[in-house]
């Protein structure tokens, strides 16, 4: 069957969530096949490990692709110590990694 590379999006935490004292940054991969994909988080260009969780949807009934969300969870205090948040995605259909990022406070 055919390969579909993911579309990648990054979402900062909501103001409402920040008020609760935590910060979740979400990297969303949409409509990809096959299922294997790798997401790496970087904060101010430093690789993060151990503080993210992934959730993969089942295959879409229409086009048999997958979606995946990776959530980086930090305390509000840690979140506000840093500026640049990025997720880097690799997939067999991509010739080079796709990176999506945002600068805290500018979105």
């Amino acid at each position: 069957r055919t390969v579909a590379a993911p579309s990648v999006f990054i979402f900062p935490p909501s103001d409402e969530q920040l008020k609760s004292g935590t910060a979740s940054v979400v990297c969303l991969l949409n409509n990809f096949y096959p299922r294997e994909a790798k997401v790496q988080w970087k904060v101010d260009n430093a690789l993060q490990s151990g503080n993210s969780q992934e959730s993969v949807t089942e295959q879409d009934s229409k086009d048999s692709t997958y979606s995946l969300s990776s959530t980086l969870t930090l305390s509000k205090a840690d979140y506000e110590k840093h500026k640049v948040y990025a997720c880097e995605v690799t997939h067999q259909g991509l010739s080079s990694p796709v990176t999506k990022s945002f600068n805290r406070g500018e979105c």
């Epitope: 096959p34 294997e36 994909a37 790798k38 690799t90 997939h91 067999q92 259909g93 991509l94 010739s95 080079s96 990694p97």
Partner: nanobody
């Protein structure tokens, strides 16, 4: 140091066939996915096909599905791309690449130098 060497490119008429080879040295390919990409002038490099580990199948780009077949010979440390019913839009430099891990993550750490395929009458 891993080295990948493509061969088999050339000039072919529309509707013709070519078989590309990619010979690997410095790493035993049997545990890794081997992929083919191509790059046409002025365009981004695009995925063509991947041969996963033996038994895990092969996958293709929509544009080549049914015309191209990827295969591998782990004993020879070589992957092949059989290209049939070639079209002018298949004209490009074809590259092979090897996954950096066994997870099929698409982290391509080594690339060949490429072989030119030109489809023209």
């Amino acid at each position: 140091q891993v080295q990948l060497q493509e061969s088999g490119g050339g000039l072919v008429q529309p509707g013709g066939s070519l078989r590309l080879s990619c010979a690997a040295s410095g790493r035993t390919i049997s545990r890794y996915a081997m992929s083919w990409f191509r790059q046409a002038p002025g365009k981004e490099r695009e995925f063509v096909a991947v041969a996963r580990r033996s038994g895990d199948g092969a996958f293709y780009a929509d544009s080549v599905q049914g015309r191209f077949t990827v295969s591998r010979d782990d004993a020879k440390n070589t992957v092949y791309l059989q290209m049939n019913s070639l079209k002018p839009e298949d004209t490009a430099v074809y590259y092979c690449a090897i996954d950096s891990d066994t997870f099929y993550s698409g982290s391509y750490d080594y690339w060949g130098q490429g072989t030119q395929v030109t489809v023209s009458s």
